[in-house]
Amino acid sequence: CKAMHVAQPAVVLASSRGIASFVCEYASPGKATEVRVTVLRQADSQVTEVCAATYMMGNELTFLDDSICTGTSSGNQVNLTIQGLRAMDTGLYICKVELMYPPPYYLGIGNGTQIYVIDPEPCPDSDF
């Protein structure tokens, strides 16, 4: 296993609809044809997997059908979008990138993106 640098933004604010997008960029040391991207959430010293996708260079990211994540790739950049976020989902979202094929296997883990989610205020009742 060889190390690889992964960069991601420090902070992202989710939209009022609970959608957050950020770019995960990795410094590929070779010409990988298969890449696996995993988003991890760290909160209260616990790390959980949010979603994962495998893709071929030049192809779309393959998330499972029930995933809350979508994404696209361009070169060594992955544009990730996480949907359905609520205030309780605020936390550090870490991008993990693995170059799966061809060998050698490379692994890179970003420093994390702090995603802030603010639940929208309910609309006040109207007399009109």
């Epitope: 696996r36 192809n59 779309e60 393959t62 059908d65 799966m100």
Partner: nanobody, 113 residues
Amino acid sequence: QVQLVESGGGLVQPGGSLTLSCAASGFTFSSYTMAWYRQAPGKEREVVAGISRSGGTTNYGDSVKGRFTISRDNAKNTVYLQMNSLKPEDTAVYYCRAVSDYWGQGTQVTVSS
């Protein structure tokens, strides 16, 4: 158990065509990006073509663009590689791939007059 079984390889003359098939079983085929790789004697294995789960996105190695077409039938758990205008340099063992987990055993394609 997981199986990827390739078929359709053989001997063909330059300029000819072949269609390779890969029948998958033992895993959820529609959840995987699928691909074809090839390996010529004395060379590294290289990507030929890839196709997304739905079949909506495809990509090709530079040397086969415009000549090869990858497709899939999720109802039949099968991925195909239509190869046209074959050249001697296309001679190789062709492998089916469920990205990034499983490999087929390969099928030989020989382009020669």
